[in-house]
């Protein structure tokens, strides 16, 4: 039975040209995390495997950095980076948990960070 919840950084905004950290945290479960996948609207950005560490998709190597922790850092942001990002936790024995983050990349310097919120 899946008892865990994923807490994410929720809706966030950042400035064009800047960087942002995408963070998810799995809580309320003792399940073992096998792997965490980071996706942007169906494109696989990166994988953090419990055994093997990080794998960054070749097409994102220049602008994606692993960490901190199981999070992901996006660099040199462009307006095209605006959209949904997903952290997908593969766990045993629970199975698959998914968290969602919406990133808005702004032209101006008035980027503000949204509040944290829970996804069951």
């Amino acid at each position: 039975m899946m008892t865990g919840t994923i807490e994410t950084t929720g809706n966030i905004s950042a400035e064009k040209g800047g960087s942002i950290i995408l963070q998810c945290h799995l809580s309320s479960t003792t399940a073992q995390v096998t792997q965490v996948n980071w996706e942007q609207q169906d494109q696989l950005l990166a994988i953090c495997n419990a055994d093997l560490g990080w794998h960054i998709s070749p097409s994102f190597k220049d602008r994606v950095a692993p960490g901190p922790g199981l999070g992901l850092t996006l660099q040199s942001l462009t307006v095209n980076d605006t959209g949904e990002y997903f952290c997908i936790y593969h766990t045993y024995p629970d199975g698959t948990y998914t968290g969602r983050i919406f990133l808005e990349v702004l032209e101006s310097s008035v980027a503000e960070h949204g509040a944290r919120f829970q996804i069951p």
Epitope: T34, Q35, N37, D42, D51, L52, H55, P93, G95, T96
Partner: antibody, heavy 119, light 107 residues
Amino acid sequence: EVQLVESGGGLVQPGGSLRLSCAASGFTFSSYIMSWVRQAPGKGLEWVSTISGGGTNTYYADSVKGRFTISRDNSKNTLYLQMNSLRAEDTAVYYCAKWLLSYYAMDYWGQGTLVTVSS
Amino acid sequence: DIQMTQSPSSLSASVGDRVTITCRASQNINVWLSWYQQKPGKAPKLLIYKASKSHTGVPSRFSGSGSGTDFTLTISSLQPEDFATYYCQQGQSYPYTFGQGTKLEIK
């Protein structure tokens, strides 16, 4: 070209043991999660066991837990399934399968090896 | 365990037909569903993963859709080589379970 070749199947008596092997080639074996899936004669597919790329984490179906052991030797590009205390209901074709790097599906399968448990 | 139920169990169709196979999960599995094709005496082959993503090299006539509990595999125009058994498999929670299969036969 990805290739998975199983071996080690055969006829064994109930209570006996067998060790299946799966020789992998055409990909970086140690980077991928691997599984064993079985198919009883004329029946559907049943997931048996999974092992992480480094071999640290192993997962089993309840029907084989405590009797089967999955392992891998990354230096030999080989996956194993040690099967003990075999029962008639373990009779099946056993397939080894490679998972996508994303761990979303099993993208390549071996041709299978038949295990028959009978007295 | 999550139960996967495919329908129909068997299906007769002709070359050129449009065919739809459905798979229903006993609980929400989000998009964590794969479709496999298996021919007699052969290993399964991956067609679709994550409900709608085509695996490399799979002909465009195969497509998948759905989320939650209801999923479909559609073959837009049957070819002679498509006559086989099709299985769905959920990857939402352990144990990863398969449907019972749908056997697609020539009419």
